[in-house]
């Protein structure tokens, strides 16, 4: 279930994933909750001074009970993932730090009069994912009233540091706030020929389309279907970016589907989460555990239930079922999509909506409206 | 609700609070915004008290104590019970409420999608309850609106658990083998939500129950897609458009 | 109009026989549980026995437990209680009463809602 | 079995007087309480069900509460017609049991 208690003075041990830095604890959990596989982490918001590279340290953690032994650590700050939060799963993150300077790759320097022109400045720049801004009483007088638009390759700060007169925070794209505007066009039969940042298996364009707006570097994306020539490549994913925010344009190509990361958008966001469940398709994957269950729906259930759980497969070959139902194998790999996609298995296939959102758009079949 | 957690502001936007005022006010039942000037409850909830000028209908809270005599509220221009309602049978416990004034629909009040009729047969995964009732049988009416996931249960299993009654194709159950989770006292008329195809819809009202969330009682519910021609007739024949389909 | 009318009732030596009929109308009949209740002269009510809808489970107090039996015809519309092996302590009017199970604040509730007129039984040598 | 316990088992009051009988059970029968009224050689008439609903009929100045164990039937203002015996019922196991009754008479 949710559980939203942050743990102070504490540590967790082991289970480490990765490690990144946040500007607080709030950041990192949320970090945590949009990883693939985290689901406690421990951040580090005081430190011995022989320890500064350490402070702001946001250590992502996995662990098959979903608990790890917990050390006292003077300054740390210990929590869960929010997977299973619903209503509380949100990538927008709106706070200013004052007195920080998140740090990462500077690829613009402009003049502004305030904090806020500077954010606003950042989310509606393709590539900035955070920003620092020297106030008027900066100790260097070249860079006051300045606003330094950042990126990174993980999407947060490569360093953070405590300095006077800074104040530092993150792109609001994720809020809906960006101005840029979103192309929601889909290139049929067309690929993109720029920059790959990663690449990810996934059973369609519209899956693949989610991954790039929650991928931190995706602007833009082409994916190959199962009928793509080269067998390495059908249902992979490959997500991409270029210098100028835009793609180059589309070369024409059979069994390609091509299309925009829409994090720029303002209404058509996606949920961080894949509801369709596709028959006939095989997610491989590393096996979790396994259940019988009555209807493919109970198994996505399932697995979203068992918080590791990623991806699932529902068997309805005869040997797979049972009196109390058909064999559900809940599954998960290390980005949490499919390490592979095979078709024509008795069954079907889909993912957890851990991540889904409790909320809804208003959009009913049958509506009771007055004239 | 039993079992459950609190609710945040706008999670549940088409749930309101029904309060009787009499000498004091008090929260009697839940109920669902369906459309501008409707709300669909249970009729039980006006057993004995069947007079549209006691009841004060709050939509867009979380927590009963914002109420204030400054609160606006609804009030109730025509109570809709349903014809083969008995208080004594106990079935058809369905009712609609015609509100005297429409509805401005915000971030934390607005509608509930209703079920068709072919989704009489739909399978529900994701659902959910809410309401401001007791968090126990011996309890008392909460201040914070309530939250709780809840497995649908078929209703043969369902009638054999309830061999005293008729689960009959009117009503759908909720509820976990072992208990634990339930609406209860307060809830009645409140919604029973799934999630289906990305879009949440009213599949049950809060009807009934052996106590709260023991073992082998599954809650019962009105099943909301059962009634969909008695829903759309009384508020067609009330002079409202009703039915509209969107491209969603 | 929903009614309930008792007969049967009379005069019957200990350790004899009498079987009572309550009569429904203006319900449908077979929806619902149906009741028996004593009330000795002078005295407070007792529950006696009930019987479901269809008459398949029947429930009885301790004090006639044996000895009485509760049936229904619902073709007839009509509900009976077969009292055997009576004695002077069965000396009551005895009522029949609709068992109403609306729902109440979210539960289930039971309630007799319509009584009989009741008839009257003595049991005395 | 479950015992109820109605108290007074005789009360006298005027016209116009707010009246309260009490009704205790041996164990928590939670709301599943009735109250009847009756009159002399009539059968018995529900009044409240579910402790604190009212039946259809019956006049507003009758009210019902409580919930558990301790029970309270109240006429807010007594009226010639309401002189008569009243008994609580509780419903909530078997046996179904009546409490001893409590008579209200005039004054």
């Known amino acids: 279930g949710c559980m939203t208690q942050l743990y102070k003075n504490t540590f967790f041990r082991g289970g480490d994933l990765a490690a990144i830095y946040t500007p607080d604890a709030q950041y990192c959990q949320k970090m945590c909750t949009f990883h693939p596989r985290c689901l406690l982490f421990s951040f580090l918001a005081v430190t011995p001074p022989k320890e500064t590279n350490k402070r702001f340290g946001c250590f992502m953690k996995e662990s098959i009970t979903g608990t790890l032994p917990r050390i006292h650590r003077t300054g740390a700050i210990s929590g869960h993932s929010l997977k299973q939060c619903g209503h509380q799963i949100s990538a927008c993150h709106r706070d200013i730090y004052k007195g920080l300077d998140m740090r990462g790759s500077n690829f613009n320097i402009s003049k502004t009069d305030n904090i806020e022109e500077c954010q606003k400045l950042c989310t509606n720049n393709f590539h900035c994912q955070f920003f620092t801004y020297a106030t008027s009483a900066f100790y260097r007088p070249e860079y006051r009233k300045k606003c330094l638009l950042k990126h990174s390759a993980s999407g947060t700060p490569t360093s953070i540091k405590s300095a006077d007169n800074l104040v530092s925070g993150f792109s609001l794209k994720s809020c809906a706030l960006s101005e840029i505007g979103c192309p929601m066009d889909i290139f049929q039969h067309s690929a993109f020929a720029d920059l790959n940042v990663s690449q990810v298996i996934t059973p369609d364009a519209f899956v693949c389309r989610t991954i790039c707006t929650f991928h931190p570097n995706c602007l833009f994306f082409t994916f190959y279907t199962n009928e793509w020539e080269t067998e390495s490549q059908r249902n992979v994913c490959f997500l991409k970016t270029s210098k100028s925010g835009r793609p180059s344009p589309p070369i024409p190509q059979e069994n390609a589907i091509s299309g925009y990361s829409l994090l720029t958008c303002r209404k058509t966001r996606p949920e961080p989460c894949h509801s369709k469940i596709y028959s006939g398709v095989d997610f491989e994957g590393e096996e979790l555990n396994v259940t019988f269950v009555q209807g493919a729906d109970v198994c996505q259930e399932t697995c979203t239930k068992t918080i590791r759980c990623q991806f699932f497969i529902y068997s309805l070959l005869p040997q797979d079922c049972k009196e109390e139902g058909c064999k559900c194998s809940l599954r998960l790999s290390t980005d949490g999509s499919p390490t592979r996609i095979t078709y024509g298995m008795q069954g079907s296939s889909g993912y957890s909506l851990r991540l889904c959102k409790l909320v809804d758009s208003p959009d009913c079949t049958t509506k009771i409206n007055a004239r | 609700i039993v079992g459950g957690t609190n609710a945040s502001l706008g999670e549940w936007p088409w749930q309101v609070s029904l309060q009787v005022k009499l000498v004091s006010q008090t929260h009697l039942c839940g109920g669902s915004i369906i459309g501008r000037q409707w709300v669909l409850t249970a009729a039980h909830c006006f057993d004995g008290i069947p007079y549209p000028d006691v009841w004060r209908i709050y939509g867009g809270i979380l927590s009963l104590s914002e109420i204030t005599k400054e609160t606006p509220s609804s009030r109730i221009k025509e109570l809709i019970i349903h014809q083969e309602y008995k208080v004594s049978e106990g079935n058809y416990d369905i009712a609609l409420i015609k509100l005297q004034t429409p509805l401005n629909y915000t971030e934390f009040q607005k509608p509930i999608c209703l079920p068709s009729k072919a989704d009489t047969n739909t399978i529900y995964t994701n659902c959910w309850v809410t309401g401001w009732g007791y968090t126990k049988e011996q309890g008392e009416t909460q201040n914070i609106l309530q939250k709780a996931t809840i497995p649908l249960v078929p209703n043969e299993e369902c009638q054999k658990k309830y061999r005293d009654y008729v689960i009959n194709k009117q009503m759908i159950c909720a509820g976990y083998k072992e208990g634990g989770t339930d609406a209860c006292k307060g809830d009645s008329g409140g919604p029973l939500v799934c999630k289906h195809s990305g879009r949440w819809q009213l599949v049950g009202i809060t009807s009934w129950g052996e106590g709260c969330a023991r073992k082998d009682q599954p809650g019962v519910y009105t099943k909301v897609s059962e009634y969909m021609d008695w829903i759309l007739e009384k508020t067609q024949s009330s002079d409202v458009r009703a039915l509209e389909t969107s491209s969603a | 109009e929903v009614q309930l009318l008792e007969s049967g009732g009379g005069l019957v030596q200990p350790g004899g026989s009498l079987r009572l009929s309550c009569a429904a109308s203006?319900?449908?009949?077979?929806?619902?549980?149906m009741t028996w209740v004593r009330q000795a002269p002078g005295k407070g009510l007792e529950w006696v026995s009930y019987i479901s809808p269809s008459g398949g489970h029947t429930i009885y107090a301790d004090s006639v437990k044996g000895r009485f039996t509760i049936s229904r015809d619902n073709s007839k519309n009509t509900l009976y209680l077969q009292m055997n092996s009576l004695r002077a302590e069965d000396t009551a009017v005895y009522y029949c009463?609709?068992?109403?199970?609306?729902?109440?604040?979210?539960?289930?509730?039971?309630?007799?809602?319509?009584w009989g007129q009741g008839t009257l039984v003595t049991v005395s040598s | 079995d479950i015992q109820m316990t109605q108290s007074p088992s005789f009360l006298s009051a005027s016209v116009g007087d707010r009246v309260t009988i009490t009704c205790r059970a041996s164990q928590g029968i939670s709301s599943y309480l009735a109250w009847y009224q009756q009159k002399p050689g009539k059968a018995p008439k529900l009044l409240i069900y579910?402790?604190?609903t009212l039946q259809s009929g019956v006049p507003s100045r009758f009210s019902g509460s409580g919930s558990g164990t301790e029970f309270t039937l109240t006429i807010s203002s007594l009226q010639p017609e309401d002189f008569a015996t009243y008994y609580c019922q509780q419903l909530n196991s078997y046996p179904l049991t009546f409490g001893g009754g409590t008579k209200v008479e005039i004054k």
């Open positions: 009463a609709r068992v109403a199970r609306g729902i109440a604040a979210r539960s289930r509730t039971s309630y007799f809602d319509y």
């Open positions: 203006g319900f449908t009949f077979s929806h619902y549980l």
């Open positions: 579910a402790a604190s």
